[in-house]
C-alpha cells in the first residue's frame, strides 16, 4: 500500500472527518461527569476517573489503554489538625483566626473531601512575628523592598498577593530575603474583575475563597524523592532533608475577607508608589508590623500539612500508526484537580475525551493515522507535573529517539475573548494553516475564519496582519517534553481580554468554585469555545501525526532566533564599559544565527522539491525536522537546573509560568551590577555566549544535507 | 557616583505648564523610587509624588493631583515632573529625590511664575 | 494628613554642643521617619532613616531615636560644619510630609 492508502482508507477520512465528528454537547457531558466530586491526586476518587477514562478510550476504539502508577510524595493538610493564621495580642491569645474552610458553593454543600485551602508541600510550622507586605513577592518586589526602601524581611512574616508570577518563585524570593513564613492572598484587584458579581452569581472570586496550589521550585526535576529517574516500584528515595524543590518556611493561602483583617492595621512605611496597592479598602502600608495601639500585636502561622508518598495513575491510550508507528505525537491533559476541576483541568479533559472518540470513530470505520497518536490523562500534576514527568523519564530512551510532538491539553479556558496559543516555532506555519481553515466563534465574526477573530483581537507585536504566539513557560505537562527532552510542544486555549482585565488567571482559579455550572452558565453556554479548542488542539494533533511531511517551518525558527539574539544583545549593551572591559562579544552567536539562517533556508527549497514517493528520503526528511527541536537541547542542562535543557527557551527564573530566551545568558546577565566579583560575572556570561552559539550552529547542521 | 542632574532654571507665566527633567547615573535607575519635593522662598519642604521607574507606578500629593504628572524615560535614566497651570505660588525650587528615603538628590531646578 | 511639628524652630549653639532636635507626629508613625541637613543654597541631605539608622557616610555624631509619635535627632558635638536646617519626615502616610525645619545656628 502506498502511505496515502494506509492513511486514509476512504476519501472521506480526512482532517474535515476528525473535525466535524467534535460535538460541543459531548464535551459538554464530558465536563459535567468529570466535575461532580473532587479528583485529588492520590485519592481514591482519582483512582477511579482514571479507570473509567481507560475504559472509556477502550470503548471509543484505541488500540490499547493502560495505567502507568507511580509512587511520589504528595502533600495534604492534617484533618483533625487544621491550618490557620491568627493575630494574637500581647499575652500570646488569639485575637482573630483565618477561615478554616471556604463556604461551599450552593448545591455541593454535601460532598465530602473537599480539601481545605493550603499550600502544598508547605512545612509545618507555627512561627509567629511582625508582618511585611511584599506586594507580589517578585525579584523586583523584594529589590525595592531591601535596597531602595531599607525593609529587612529576615525573621519577618510576609504577605504577598496572588499574581503575576508562579507562586512557587513567590515563596523561593521570600525565603532568600529570610522570611520565616508566607502568607499567600487574593486580592480583588488581581482576582475581582469590575462589573461582575462573585460566584454563585458571576464568575468572580468570592471573599472566602481561596487559591490552593502547590509552592514547590522543582524545576522540572519531577517527583522530589527521585529527581531524573521514575518513582517506581524498585526506586532509590532521597530523605525528606535532600528532596528536590521542597520550601523550608510554612506558607498558607487565605482569602481577600481574611487578607483584610490583617492588612487593616498594618502601619511601618507607605507603599512605594501606586503599583503596590490593590483593590482593599486598606493603606497597603508595607510594615514591619502593626500600627499604633495595634504595634504590639503579632501574626502567627498553624501549619500542620504532611508529605505523604503516595501512588498516582496515569491513563496511556495508543492509536497505532499504519506508516511509521515508531513515530510517536502525544496529546496530553492532566485530570487530578485541587476540588471539582470545573476548569482546570477538566475542561481539557473533556476536550481530550472528545478528541479520542473522534479518533477511535475513524479508526473503527478502519481509518489510521499515518504516526502513533498517544494520548494520556496525566496525573498529580497540580503537584509540580509529577505525573506526565514520570512517566516521561520512564520512558525517555523511547521519547528522544520517536517523539514527534507533544499537544498539551490542561484548561480549555481561561477566558472567552480570543484564542491564546503558546509553542514552539515550528509550530507557527501549522498553527496558522489549521485555524485559518477553522471557524471563529467568536460574536462578530461569523462566516469569518479563527485566524481572522484571534488577528483581530490578539495582534501579534513584530508582524502585521499576524496573531501573537507565545514562548512556552512552565507549569504544565509539556515541560519535560519540550524544556527536558526537546520534543516539539504547543499549547491552545481560549482566553480573557488581557488589555481589559488585569487580573491575573481567572478569578476562581483552584477554587471550591471552579465548578460545571461555572463554566456553563458563565464562560461558555454553547461550549463553542470549547469546541474551537477541541478543533485546534485536534487538529494540530490530527496533521501531526497524518502529514506525509511534517509541518514543522524551520525557517521559523531562524525568525525567531535573530529576534532573541537581538534582544539579549541590547539587554548586555546596558552595560557598554564592562563588555569592552571583558571583552564580551556577540559575533559568534550572531554568526551561528546567520548560518542557521541560510541553512534552514535551503532545507525548505530541499523540502519544496525532494522525491516524497521515496519512502527512505521521506523519512530522512522527517526525521530531520522532528530532530531539530532535540538539536538544541545541551545534555549538561543550565546552571542550578539540570532538567532545564532547552538552551533556547526555558522557565524564567523569576517566574516559572513565563518562558526567556537564551535563558542561560539572560540570567547571567540579570542583576550583574550587584554582583561582587564582576570579572567571574562577566565570565560567566561570555560561557554562555558560547554555549548558544555553539548550539544553535550545531542545531542548524543538523540541517544541512547528510552527505 | 550616584548623581541626580535636573534640568536648567525656568520661567513662566500663569497658566503654563512646565517640565523639569532629572538625569539619574552611577546606579541602576529602575531599583529606585523617584520623588519630586519643591521648596518655595524661604520657606520648608512640600512633597510633590514620586515614581516607581521600573514599572510607572505613581502616587501624588493630592493638593498637586489634578496638575501633576510625572513620567520616566527608562532608556536615557530619566525622570520628569510637569506641573500644568502655574500660579505665582508654584515659584520654588524643585528637587528629584532619588530612594524611597530621599537618599541623593539633584541640585534643584529654579521655576518662576510671574506675569 | 499627617502633621509634623519640629522644635525648636531655631537652636543657637557653640562647637562642640551636645544638640537635640525633636519631632512630634500628629498620630503614630512607627519608626517611618528621616531626617535631613539642608545647608543654603544646596539641596537637602540624608542623615537617618527609619527612625535610627545613619546614613551611608554621615558622622556617628548623628543619631536619631523614637517611635510611635515622638522623634528625636542628636548631634554629640557640634562641629562647624553642621550648622544648617534640619528637617524630619514621615513616611507611614501618603502624602509623605516634612517638619518645617529646625535651624542650627552659632550662638
Known amino acids: 500500500k502506498s502511505s496515502n492508502e494506509a492513511t486514509n482508507i476512504t476519501p472521506k477520512h480526512n482532517m474535515k472527518a476528525f473535525l466535524d465528528e467534535l460535538k460541543a454537547e459531548n464535551i459538554k457531558k464530558f465536563l459535567y461527569n468529570f466535575t461532580q466530586i473532587p479528583h485529588l491526586a492520590g485519592t481514591e476518587q482519582n483512582f477511579q476517573l482514571a479507570k473509567q477514562i481507560q475504559s472509556q478510550w477502550k470503548e471509543f476504539g484505541l488500540d490499547s489503554v493502560e495505567l502507568a502508577h507511580y509512587d511520589v510524595l504528595l502533600s495534604y493538610p492534617n484533618k483533625t489538625h487544621p491550618n490557620y493564621i491568627s493575630i494574637i495580642n500581647e499575652d500570646g491569645n488569639e485575637i482573630f483566626n483565618t477561615s478554616l474552610f471556604e463556604p461551599p458553593p450552593p448545591g455541593y454543600e454535601n460532598v465530602s473531601d473537599i480539601v481545605p485551602p493550603f499550600s502544598a508541600f508547605s512545612p509545618q510550622g507555627m512561627p509567629e512575628g511582625d508582618l511585611v507586605y511584599v506586594n507580589y513577592a517578585r525579584t523586583e518586589d523584594f529589590f525595592k523592598l531591601e535596597r531602595d526602601m531599607k525593609i529587612n524581611c529576615s525573621g519577618k512574616i510576609v504577605i504577598a498577593r496572588y499574581g503575576k508570577v508562579f507562586r512557587g518563585n513567590k515563596v523561593k524570593n521570600a525565603q532568600l530575603a529570610g522570611a520565616k513564613g508566607v502568607i499567600l492572598y487574593s486580592d480583588p484587584a488581581d482576582y475581582f474583575a469590575p462589573g461582575v458579581k462573585s460566584y454563585p452569581d458571576g464568575w468572580n472570586l468570592p471573599g472566602g475563597g481561596v487559591q490552593r496550589g502547590n509552592i514547590l521550585n522543582l524545576n522540572g526535576a519531577g517527583d522530589p524523592l527521585t529527581p531524573g529517574y521514575p518513582a517506581n516500584e524498585y526506586a532509590y528515595r532521597r530523605g525528606i532533608a535532600e528532596a528536590v524543590g521542597l520550601p523550608s518556611i510554612p506558607v498558607h493561602p487565605i482569602g481577600y475577607y481574611d487578607a483584610q483583617k490583617l492588612l487593616e492595621k498594618m502601619g511601618g512605611s507607605a507603599p512605594p508608589d501606586s503599583s503596590w496597592r490593590g483593590s482593599l479598602k486598606v493603606p497597603y502600608n508595607v510594615g514591619p508590623g502593626f500600627t499604633g495601639n495595634f504595634s504590639t500585636q503579632k501574626v502567627k502561622m498553624h501549619i500542620h500539612s504532611t508529605n505523604e508518598v503516595t501512588r498516582i495513575y496515569n491513563v496511556i491510550g495508543t492509536l497505532r500508526g499504519a506508516v511509521e508507528p515508531d513515530r510517536y505525537v502525544i496529546l496530553g491533559g492532566h485530570r487530578d484537580s485541587w476540588v471539582f476541576g470545573g476548569i482546570d483541568p477538566q475542561s481539557g479533559a473533556a476536550v481530550v475525551h472528545e478528541i479520542v472518540r473522534s479518533f477511535g470513530t475513524l479508526k473503527k470505520e478502519g481509518w489510521r493515522p499515518r504516526r502513533t497518536i498517544l494520548f494520556a490523562s496525566w496525573d498529580a500534576e497540580e503537584f509540580g507535573l509529577l505525573g506526565s514527568t514520570e512517566w516521561a523519564e520512564e520512558n525517555s530512551r523511547l521519547l528522544q529517539e520517536r517523539g514527534v510532538a507533544y499537544i498539551n491539553a490542561d484548561s480549555s479556558i481561561e477566558g472567552n475573548y480570543t484564542l491564546r496559543v503558546d509553542c514552539t516555532p515550528l509550530m507557527y506555519s501549522l498553527v496558522h494553516n489549521l485555524t485559518k481553515e477553522l471557524k471563529s466563534p467568536d460574536e462578530g465574526f461569523e462566516g469569518k475564519s479563527l485566524y481572522e477573530s484571534w488577528t483581530k483581537k490578539s495582534p501579534s507585536p513584530e508582524f502585521s496582519g499576524m496573531p501573537r504566539i507565545s514562548k512556552l513557560g512552565s507549569g504544565n505537562d509539556f515541560e519535560v517534553f519540550f524544556q527536558r527532552l526537546g520534543i516539539a510542544s504547543g499549547r491552545a486555549r481560549y482566553t480573557k481580554n488581557w488589555e481589559t482585565n488585569k487580573f491575573s488567571g481567572y478569578p476562581l482559579y483552584h477554587s471550591v468554585y471552579e465548578t460545571y455550572e461555572l463554566v456553563e452558565k458563565f464562560y461558555d453556554p454553547m461550549f463553542k469555545y470549547h469546541l474551537t479548542v477541541a478543533q485546534v488542539r485536534g487538529g494540530m494533533v490530527f496533521e501531526l501525526a497524518n502529514s506525509i511531511v511534517l509541518p514543522f517551518d524551520c525557517r521559523d525558527y531562524a525568525v525567531v532566533l535573530r529576534k532573541y539574539a537581538d534582544k539579549i544583545y541590547s539587554i548586555s549593551m546596558k552595560h557598554p564599559q564592562e563588555m569592552k572591559t571583558y571583552s564580551v562579544s556577540f559575533d559568534s552567536l550572531f554568526s551561528a544565527v546567520k548560518n542557521f539562517t541560510e541553512i534552514a533556508s535551503k532545507f525548505s527549497e530541499r523540502l519544496q522539491d525532494f522525491d516524497k514517493s521515496n519512502p527512505i528520503v521521506l523519512r530522512m526528511m522527517n526525521d530531520q525536522l522532528m530532530f531539530l527541536e532535540r538539536a538544541f537541547i545541551d545534555p549538561l542542562g543550565l546552571p542550578d537546573r539540570p532538567f532545564y535543557r532547552h538552551v533556547i527557551y526555558a522557565p524564567s527564573s523569576h517566574n516559572k509560568y513565563a518562558g526567556e530566551s537564551f535563558p542561560g545568558i539572560y540570567d547571567a546577565l540579570f542583576d550583574i551590577e550587584s554582583k561582587v566579583d564582576p570579572s567571574k560575572a562577566w565570565g560567566e556570561v561570555k560561557r554562555q555566549i558560547y554555549v548558544a552559539a555553539f548550539t544553535v550552529q550545531a542545531a542548524a547542521e543538523t540541517l544541512s544535507e547528510v552527505a | 557616583e550616584v548623581q541626580l542632574v535636573q534640568s536648567g532654571a525656568e520661567v513662566k507665566k500663569p497658566g503654563a505648564s512646565v517640565k523639569v527633567s532629572c538625569k539619574a547615573s552611577?546606579?541602576?535607575?529602575?531599583?529606585?523610587?523617584i520623588h519630586w519635593v519643591r521648596q518655595a522662598p524661604g520657606k520648608g519642604l512640600e512633597w510633590i509624588g514620586n515614581i516607581n521607574p521600573n514599572n510607572g507606578g505613581t502616587t501624588y500629593n493630592q493638593k498637586f493631583e489634578d496638575r501633576v504628572t510625572i513620567t520616566v524615560d527608562k532608556s536615557t535614566s530619566t525622570a520628569y515632573m510637569e506641573l500644568s497651570s502655574l500660579r505665582s505660588e508654584d515659584t520654588a525650587v524643585y528637587y528629584c529625590?532619588?530612594?524611597?528615603?530621599?537618599?541623593?538628590w539633584g541640585q534643584g531646578t529654579t521655576v518662576t511664575v510671574s506675569s | 494628613d499627617i502633621q509634623m511639628t519640629q522644635s525648636p524652630s531655631t537652636l543657637s549653639a557653640s562647637v562642640g554642643d551636645r544638640v537635640t532636635i525633636t519631632c512630634k507626629a500628629s498620630q503614630d508613625v512607627g519608626t517611618a521617619v528621616d531626617w535631613y541637613q539642608q545647608k543654603p543654597g544646596q539641596a537637602p541631605k540624608l542623615l537617618i532613616y527609619?527612625?535610627?539608622t545613619r546614613h551611608t557616610g554621615v558622622p556617628d555624631r548623628f543619631s536619631g531615636s523614637g517611635s510611635g509619635t515622638d522623634f528625636t535627632l542628636t548631634i554629640s558635638r557640634l562641629q562647624p560644619e553642621d550648622f544648617a536646617v534640619y528637617y524630619c519626615q514621615q513616611f507611614t502616610r501618603y502624602p509623605l510630609t516634612f517638619g518645617q525645619g529646625t535651624k542650627v545656628d552659632i550662638k
Open positions: 527609619w527612625a535610627s
Open positions: 529625590a532619588g530612594g524611597w528615603t530621599f537618599d541623593y
Open positions: 552611577g546606579y541602576t535607575f529602575t531599583e529606585y523610587t
